[in-house]
């Protein structure tokens, strides 16, 4: 009971309500104020969570009732507030006060194993007392309320192998188990509350206990004897056969390795198939029937992983005997060497022996051999394997020959072997040196004595060696040529010097200088070479760079005055040609009379990113000439606008999009105003030809002989790209750029 300090306050019993009451309403207690002496009219009010729903108060008496079944496990405590009001005044007699309704526990919940399903793994053969797993049950009842939540564990199924500790739920092993006999066990555990007393509630759970494998079994061969055969031609790594051992263990504990006990392990090996654990006997080294026709092998098997404590179970490894029979094969010939390198000097006569190759039959019958040679017609081979030349060899033509020699057995031509033969041709000094290039040599008319005219060098087709050396000499026979002298630089070059001051182009325009070049080969070879020196009018600069252009005309005997006259004539002819071209175009006449055969011109298109050969595909001129569009005469004032409109039409070849048109027109404007644009007379053509040019065709293709008198002044309006056309066809057209 509670009263506040000034002797005013609430009076009530300690409020407890049992859970799970089945009555419609259950009286919990009565709220009373000690001011309520029976003469007053006091009204009691209940406030807070649960008031008016779970708990109802008789406001006249203060009696509190629970009108719902309560579950302590859902809610064990209700905190409510109470008020007392004097009916006469309508005012609260006391301050609002808080009180508690506690829900008392009954044993209405059975133990539950919340962590189900339980599964545990324990090694087989584990000793007694080994901990397997701990199971734990939960009871929702109040652990502080008697024994409602005090549990005891017991084993309903699983004896005699397992036991459970009553208070902890720890499951332990009670006797050793062999996985190879049974690999899993179902154990049923019961948990009882009320420490097992009468009226207790219980719950059960199942525990799956799996035995994990330990390596307590050794592998044993299925068979004690195996017989295999192998061909002597079998390559290394060939599978001869399979052997098999069984192990009652699983996983890593069943992994095994096979081995060969004796010396035959050099010839045979056993590898394991990891999927099947079979031993695959393979050939480690080639066998030869002629050498040994059968082998006896003793193989043994053991586990890969054995713990020390389990080693006693693995003593005396299982063994098996394998007999391998070698089968005879007709083997191909065998060359003594895998390949041959032979050498021969160049220039030897045909029939010269280069060298000999040899192959033998490895079989017992020792068949004779027949040889064939491929790779060059310069060599042949006889039945002894001797290779001879069939032509004289020139190192400067080919320094190496790659030949293939094939040997076949006479008794069985199907048995073939090949070997590579490399023939190196040695160099001999059989090529004289010569000028390394053609020299176009000039000397100025005003050259001075001692002036360098030409530096010459030589080459030799023979094999270049480090101490290769050339010697240069002025021929003694060249007595009439004392105008020049030769100096050997001793570095495989020589210098030609002027031996006099001044030359006369008119009197002696050309000099021929005979030069001897010798090499240092054994024997030494010498060649005679002629150097042509042309006299040139270099002017004051004494620079011979311009001489190459003048040379031809001067050599032909033309004088300076004649050359100038010829050039003027050429220019006049060109001017006349262009005048005729312009007049013909203005009258829309063909420049050339029409022939029976049309021209086919390659039109180069530059309107793509590059199409390789497609850029230069010839158009069918017939198609161009049979155009359905007639180029009708238009009024001159409209032609400029028409060209622009035709240009716009040509833009519509691609997608008809205002965005594309705007973009291309911007690019056109950009190109027209670009100071770095290409020369205006460069040809720019497009795949779409339009619907005809108001200017008419400028080519010989499909020209019409109408519109004789056209005015081309409108070309000036088309921008800088049409400047060249405007200047060619316009009448007194002024460039406007």
């Amino acid at each position: 009971d509670y009263k506040d300090d000034d002797d005013k306050g609430w009076v009530w019993n300690q409020f407890f309500v049992p859970e799970e009451m089945n009555t419609t309403s259950h009286h919990i207690g009565q709220l009373r104020s000690d001011l309520d002496n029976g003469n007053n009219s006091f009204q009691y009010k209940l406030l807070g969570a649960g008031a008016g729903s779970t708990f109802i108060i008789d406001e006249r008496t203060g009696d509190i009732y629970a009108i719902q079944k309560l579950d302590r496990e859902e809610r064990s405590l209700y905190i409510l507030r109470a008020q007392v009001i004097d009916i006469a005044t309508g005012r609260a007699v006391e301050p609002e006060s808080e009180f508690v309704i506690k829900v008392s526990d009954i044993n209405d919940n059975e133990p539950k194993f919340l962590d189900e399903p339980y599964e545990a793994i324990v090694p087989e053969m584990s000793p007694e007392g080994t901990l397997v797993i701990q199971v734990t049950a939960s009871d929702a009842d109040d652990p502080s309320s008697g024994n409602n939540a005090r549990l005891l564990y017991s084993l309903l199924q699983g004896q005699p192998y397992f036991s459970v500790e009553p208070t902890t739920g720890v499951i332990r092993i009670s006797s050793k188990m062999d996985r190879e006999l049974q690999d899993e066990y179902w154990v049923i555990i019961q948990a009882k509350d009320m420490i097992g007393q009468p009226g207790a509630l219980s719950g059960t759970t199942s525990v799956l206990i799996k035995l994990s494998d330990v390596n307590d079994n050794k592998p044993i061969f299925k068979e004690s004897f195996y017989r295999f055969t192998i061909s002597e031609s079998a390559p290394i790594g060939t599978s001869i056969g399979k052997i098999m051992a069984y192990d009652d263990d699983i996983g890593e504990n069943a992994e095994m390795e096979y081995s060969i006990e004796d010396d035959d392990s050099k010839i045979f090996d056993i590898i394991i198939d990891n999927d099947t654990q079979e031993g695959i006997v393979i050939l480690k080294k080639k066998v030869d029937f002629e050498q040994q026709s059968y082998y006896g092998i003793r193989a043994k098997v053991k586990n890969c992983h054995v713990d020390e404590e389990l080693a006693p179970a693995h003593v005396n490894a299982s063994t098996t005997y394998i007999k391998v029979q070698v089968e005879d094969e007709d083997e191909p010939p065998v060359f003594l060497l895998p390949y041959y390198i032979l050498e021969i000097p160049e220039g030897k006569p045909y029939g010269t022996i280069v060298g000999t190759v040899s192959a033998t039959d490895p079989d017992r019958r020792q068949s004779p051999m027949r040889y064939y040679l491929t790779g060059s017609k310069m060599f042949d081979i006889n039945d002894n394997g001797t290779i001879i030349t069939t032509n004289m060899l020139d190192r400067e033509v080919s320094a190496w020959y790659n030949l293939t020699v094939t040997a076949t057995e006479t008794y069985n031509v199907q048995q073939i072997s090949s070997a590579h033969v490399y023939v190196q041709v040695f160099n001999i000094n059989d090529n004289a040196p010569e000028f390394s290039q053609f020299y176009e040599t000039y000397v100025c008319e005003n050259a001075e004595s001692g002036e360098i005219v030409q530096i010459i060098s030589a080459i030799d087709r023979d094999e270049s060696i480090e101490d290769h050396h050339f010697y240069f000499n002025h021929s003694l026979e060249d007595t009439n040529n004392s105008s020049f002298m030769l100096t050997d630089n001793q570095d495989n070059t020589a210098v030609i010097l002027s031996n006099r001051t001044g030359f006369n182009l008119k009197e002696e325009p050309v000099f021929y200088m005979i030069i001897l070049i010798a090499d240092n080969g054994i024997p030494s070879l010498t060649s005679t070479n002629t150097l042509t020196i042309q006299v040139c009018d270099c002017g004051d600069s004494r620079n011979t760079e311009t001489c190459a252009n003048k040379g031809l005309l001067f050599i032909m005997g033309f004088r300076t005055e004649a050359i100038i006259a010829i050039m003027i004539c050429v220019m006049v002819i060109f001017g006349f040609f262009f005048l005729i071209l312009a007049l013909k175009q203005r009258r829309k006449e063909t420049l050339f009379p029409e022939k029976t055969e049309d021209f086919r011109e390659n039109i180069f298109c530059y309107d793509d990113e590059g199409g390789g050969e497609e850029d230069s595909e010839a158009f069918d001129i017939v198609e161009l000439r049979q155009s359905t569009v007639m180029r009708e005469r238009k009024p001159q004032r409209s032609k400029s606008a028409e060209i622009r409109s035709l240009y716009r039409q040509s833009l519509q070849v691609g997608p008809d999009s205002a965005i594309f048109r705007k973009f291309i027109l911007e690019k056109l404007e950009e190109a027209n105003t670009d100071p770095c644009a290409p020369p205006f007379d460069s040809l720019q053509t497009f795949a779409y030809e339009g619907t005809g040019s108001s200017a008419g065709s400028l080519s010989s293709l499909a020209s019409r002989d109408t519109d004789q008198e056209d005015d081309f002044d409108y070309l000036n309006d088309l921008g800088p790209r049409f400047k060249r056309l405007a200047s060619m066809f316009g009448s007194a057209v002024q460039p406007n750029n």
Partner: antibody, heavy 122, light 108 residues
Amino acid sequence: QVQLQESGPGLVKPSETLSLTCTVSGGSINSYYWSWIRQPPGKGLEWIGYIYYIGSTNYNPSLKSRVTISVDTSKNQFSLKLSSVTAADTALYYCARESRYRSGWYDAFDIWGQGTMVTVSS
Amino acid sequence: DIVLTQSPGTLSLSPGERATLSCRASQSVAGSYLAWYQQKPGQAPRLLIYGASSRATGIPDRFSGSGSGTDFTLTISRLEPEDFAVYYCQQYGKSPITFGQGTRLEMK
């Protein structure tokens, strides 16, 4: 609409227990206070006591020692037991419902049964 | 207990007349928790007025109640033939609930 009907023996012997039942129809017994009132022949009305639907009771002190009022919400009924009856307990017994004009406190009786006459006689 | 005394014991009036019934409490009735009932022979009482002055549902407005503390009055402004019956006052401001002895209203 809510109607009340009293039922029970019309004749009770002295010193025995008078038992009456009031059946509520047309509405729920929940959330109301239910009273028993009696009227001796030719006399005024006397309040016997009430029961709240939750089971809370309050009796007239003059009869408290002999009166028990109970409720069965599942049957929508409430009952009166008056023990040790005498001839003075002969009366017309009414069951009535308090209105809810004033929540929580006592209120006037807005619905009455037709009454059942109980005679205490040997 | 609060004792209610009604007066007069019997009141003889004619239809159309005004009737005034009095109820006096032995002590103040808390919150004016006083009601008036009408009972006709062979019938259960019928609630007329609650809270001293509030008309119950379906009661004609010729019935009115007044008063507080210890003195309360029921007034029938214009008597109708069906109004002739016994009238009881009841207090419910304090337990136990008590009734007056009644006033018989008869036709003159």
